[in-house]
């Protein structure tokens, strides 16, 4: 299985971010067997916190850090498991992992996105 994600995603502070994660598989998606986990890490060596799962249906784990700002925006039948993160904050910066299992494919797919939150530059002062 091959997973496609951007290595780094730059998002403006306060805007909505689509975290894209798509995959290729030799097999069609059987919703009874397909599984998906999205996790978040504050840093490379930090522990992973699961915030969204697919087990026959989407399960939003409603982590305190994300409150109600996460929603699933993909379609597993179309090999798309992307999520939306609303109103991105600097605290959201870090690493987002999507993990996919699509039996009978034996290989677990993994995509890793570094989310960088861009702060608005202050307007340039008029020197005249």
């Amino acid at each position: 299985m091959e997973v496609t994600v951007p290595a780094t995603l730059n998002v403006l502070n306060g805007s909505d971010a689509r975290l894209p994660c798509t995959f290729n598989s030799c097999y069609t998606v059987n919703h009874k067997q397909f599984s998906l986990n999205w996790t978040y890490q504050e840093c490379n060596n930090c522990s992973e916190e699961m915030f969204l799962q697919f087990r026959m249906k989407i399960i939003n784990l409603k982590l305190e850090r994300f409150q109600d700002r996460v929603e699933f925006s993909g379609n597993p039948s179309k090999y798309d498991v992307s999520v939306m993160l609303r109103n991105v904050q600097p605290e959201d910066e870090g690493i987002y992992n999507c993990y996919i299992m699509n039996p009978p494919d034996r290989h677990r797919g993994h995509g890793k996105i570094h989310l960088q939150v861009l702060m608005e530059e202050p307007p340039e002062r008029d020197s005249t």
């Epitope: 504050e42 490379n44 861009l118 702060m119």
Partner: nanobody
Framework: EVQLVESGGGLVQAGGSLRLSCAAS????????MRWYRQAPGKQREFVAS???????SYTDSVKGRFTISRDNAKNTVYLQMNSLKPEDTAVYYC???????RGQGTLVTVSS
């Protein structure tokens, strides 16, 4: 792999000042942003301040006018000057760059009333 090491924390009375440092083991010139976060016991981490490669700074509302972030690219170090400290500033402060790839172990700041 970049190591980030924070220092400068300690115990200070309300109204006092501290200067935190974050030293990187390699050049920080490639990091678009360097950021300071803090985490109080039992709470989520909170963004404190960031500085862009060009020097533009951003702060969380609760520290504006009291804290100043700066970076010395030649020394591969980022600083956080903290003035007029309040008990609610008590937390572990750590720096992070870029996009959460690296972060230090943190330095504890305790502000007594």
């Amino acid at each position: 792999e970049v190591q980030l090491v924070e220092s400068g924390g300690g115990l200070v009375q309300a109204g006092g000042s501290l200067r935190l440092s974050c030293a990187a083991s390699k050049s920080i010139l490639s990091f678009a942003y360097m950021r300071w976060y803090r985490q109080a016991p039992g709470k989520q981490r909170e963004f404190v301040a960031s500085i862009a490669i060009g020097g533009a700074t951003s702060y969380t509302d609760s520290v504006k006018g009291r804290f100043t972030i700066s970076r010395d690219n030649a020394k591969n170090t980022v600083y956080l000057q903290m003035n007029s400290l309040k008990p609610e500033d008590t937390a572990v402060y750590y720096c992070s760059a870029p996009a959460g790839q690296y972060r230090g172990q943190g330095t504890l700041v305790t502000v007594s009333s």
